[in-house]
């Protein structure tokens, strides 16, 4: 039933690029290598594409010409490897090309930076932007993907094409427009915050993938497609699983023209059998490709079916719980998994696989015992406590949130996690923190019957950007244990951690503390950015601070950057008043 | 509770076809494992065919590449297309299922079981 299996075809590349067609073809090239060599380039970039894609022409008209039977990995590994400046550039990465593949491809991979060190892209002005699309098209969309997977090594490279489609469509439109910049400015917005939270989610899969195994990411699949379609049948299921975890594995993996490749047919697939799958699909399986696939990644849960009888009877009275368990592991689990799944759209993700991992520990526990049954036959009342922590874990954070608001609800937070894990970068607290932060916004508005799939998922992808940001630079024995011990724990671990009663106190720097009158033309975001660095770099000095302490000294400084940027001479109140701050500061907390 | 009715059987010629229908009912068995069981006068009950969730199939090997057993999910329902009858084809044959993912092929292995349908071969 595979959707993939294809004949084999003598050349790769050929194959790839009548299947994807050329335009498809260069944009994924350009994604792969800008994910592989961050800091090349643009032109760089486009030169080796434009040769990759003249040497699979050559291919498409002769497959059995010299080299075109080389693996994809060989073809743009080689290419890669021609890059001049390679060792100046990247250092060890270098290394790599001295390695055969598959290591030698596993090798860039590793060297994967999910911060690069490269400058924050700033936006032109309208005009400055609309007459560089006209000018040349081409080039400037080649730049969008360019920059964009540069800054995002795991972007999902199929759906980069989709974003890239509607950048295109926002300036056809607003070039055109009366008033360019209200046109523009609000779907670049748009398209900037869409990317960062889908570059995020994607970089979960790749971690579930990466450091937890195909069977991590198999079980988050089963249990979110059985929530989103729950009148398919678990072989149905079970069969998109397989398909989805091909199409994640080859975009984690760097193969992305087969990924892309994959993706179409598999969207062809579920548009092909919606019957059987779910009554929610029409409105996605008349749209064009890009769209259909994006759309049905993001389509409504379809109606549970009427009368599901209970979980019990199959899954715990049954006399063959333990011969199904014996003879087919994971498949049993998979099917506990599903029926759970399908029939609470109303739980996380991750409360699922607790919930499965739960009654996997019970069953192999209980199927050696002397009375097996007796030992398995209270494993759902085990799964209450793990039900009510995350329903009134979320119940008082949207408290607080409404209470607080978004930016003091993300203060709240900053000084949570600052203390848990004081040894964390500030920019890394400050960044995680303010998303952690955004779940209010985003999941309090819904309904109970939503808030939890809506705030569980989306902190197990914000706390992963904690996780693969540490990892780059490890600081903390705390966040490392989290991050690595358990997948589907980590929000808990993270939850459950509390003052790091072993830190000692950062050195007080009043530089630190010294603002200018720069901070006056900043954005409302890029203020409330400095300020939230303050608050952070105040908790490492002084990790005992009270709440009312804290606020006390971000209360003073608000009304300080206020007041200067109100004053003449800007930067004369920032110098003098700045000083009188510091030392009231430093008095309001005993430093 | 499972309930299970056979039907299509007949009196048939050696060498002819005949399908048979197992209709479920009671709740959802997409997951179940079915199979086909016959019973001949004065003899135990044995295995025909059976089919798992994901709709692999066993054969006893007296009835291997004439019969063939199916499901159709959507409307609950297991198949037995029976072809090249012989005369010792000739039983009762059963529907049964039980909540098994690897489909037994011992009759005690079954949880319910249909009423059963007659099959006769003439010769």
């Known amino acids: 039933r595979g959707v993939f299996r294809r004949d084999a075809h003598k050349s790769e590349v050929a194959h790839r690029f009548k299947d994807l067609g050329e335009e498809n073809f260069k944009a994924l090239v350009l994604i792969a290598f800008a994910q592989y060599l961050q800091q090349c380039p643009f032109e760089d970039h486009v030169k080796l594409v434009n040769e990759v894609t003249e040497f699979a022409k050559t291919c498409v008209a002769d497959e059995s010409a010299e080299n075109c039977d080389k693996s994809l990995h060989t073809l743009f590994g080689d290419k890669l490897c021609t890059v001049a400046t390679l060792r100046e550039t990247y250092g060890e990465m270098a290394d790599c090309c001295a390695k055969q593949e598959p290591e030698r491809n596993e090798c860039f991979l590793q060297h994967k930076d999910d911060n690069p060190n490269l400058p924050r892209l700033v936006r032109p002005e309208v005009d400055v932007m609309c007459t560089a699309f006209h000018d040349n098209e081409e080039t400037f969309l080649k730049k969008y993907l360019y920059e964009i997977a540069r800054r995002h090594p795991y972007f999902y490279a199929p759906e980069l094409l989709f974003f890239a489609k509607r950048y295109k469509a926002a300036f056809t439109e607003c070039c055109q427009a009366a008033d360019k910049a209200a046109c523009l400015l609000p779907k670049l917005d748009e398209l900037r915050d869409e990317g960062k939270a889908s570059s995020a989610k994607q970089r979960l899969k790749c971690a579930s993938l990466q450091k937890f195994g195909e069977r991590a990411f198999k079980a988050w699949a089963v249990a979110r497609l059985s929530q989103r379609f729950p009148k398919a049948e678990f072989a149905e299921v079970s069969k998109l699983v397989t398909d989805l975890t091909k199409v994640h594995t080859e975009c984690c993996h760097g193969d992305l023209l087969e990924c892309a490749d994959d993706r179409a047919d598999l969207a062809k697939y579920i548009c092909e059998n919606q019957d059987s799958i779910s009554s929610k699909l029409k409105e996605c399986c008349e749209k064009p490709l890009l769209e259909k696939s994006h759309c049905i990644a993001e389509v409504e849960n379809d109606e549970m079916p009427a009368d599901l009888p209970s979980l019990a009877a199959d899954f715990v009275e049954s006399k063959d719980v333990c011969k199904n368990y014996a003879e087919a592991k994971d498949v049993f689990l998979g099917m506990f998994l599903y029926e759970y799944a399908r029939r609470h759209p109303d739980y996380s993700v991750v409360l699922l696989l607790r919930l499965a991992k739960t009654y996997e520990t019970t069953l192999e526990k209980c199927c050696a015992a002397a009375d097996p049954h007796e030992c398995y036959a209270k494993v759902f009342d085990e799964f209450k406590p793990l039900v009510e922590e995350p329903q009134n874990l979320i119940k008082q954070n949207c408290e607080l949130f409404e209470q607080l608001g978004e930016y003091k609800f993300q203060n709240a937070l900053l000084v949570r996690y600052t203390k848990k894990v004081p040894q964390v970068s500030t920019p890394t607290l400050v960044e995680v923190s303010r998303n952690l932060g955004k779940v209010g916004s985003k999941c309090c508005k819904h309904p109970e019957a939503k808030r939890m799939p809506c705030a569980e998922d989306y902190l197990s992808v914000v706390l992963n950007q904690l996780c693969v940001l540490h990892e780059k630079t490890p600081v903390s024995d705390r966040v490392t244990k989290c991050c690595t011990e358990s997948l589907v724990n980590r929000r808990p671990c993270f939850s459950a951690l509390e003052v790091d009663e072993t830190y000692v106190p950062k050195e007080f720097n009043a530089e630190t503390f010294t603002f200018h009158a720069d901070i006056c033309t900043l954005s409302e975001k890029e203020r409330q950015i400095k300020k939230q660095t303050a608050l952070v770099e105040l908790v490492k000095h002084k990790p005992k601070a009270t709440k009312e302490q804290l606020k006390a000294v971000m209360d003073d400084f608000a009304a300080f950057v206020e007041k200067c940027c109100k004053a003449d001479d800007k930067e004369t109140c920032f110098a003098e008043e700045g000083k009188k701050l510091v030392a009231a500061s430093q008095a309001a907390l005993g430093l | 509770q499972v309930q299970l009715i056979e039907s299509g059987g007949g009196l048939v010629q050696a060498g002819g076809s005949l399908g048979l229908s197992c209709a479920a009912s009671?709740?959802?068995?997409?997951?179940?494992?079915a199979a086909w069981f016959r019973q001949a006068p004065g003899k135990e009950r044995e295995f025909v065919a059976a089919?798992?969730?994901?709709?692999?199939?066993t054969y006893a090997d007296s009835v291997k590449g004439r019969f063939t057993i199916s499901r159709d999910n959507a409307k609950s329902t297991v198949a037995l297309q029976m072809n090249s009858l012989k005369p010792e084809d000739t039983a009762v044959y059963y529907c049964?299922?039980?909540?098994?993912?690897?489909?037994?092929?011992?009759?005690?292995?079954?949880?319910?079981w249909g009423q059963g349908t007659q099959v006769t071969v003439s010769s």
């Open positions: 009671g709740r959802p068995v997409s997951n179940y494992a």
């Open positions: 089919i798992n969730w994901n709709k692999t199939a």
């Open positions: 049964a299922a039980v909540f098994r993912v690897v489909a037994p092929k011992t009759q005690y292995d079954y949880d319910y």
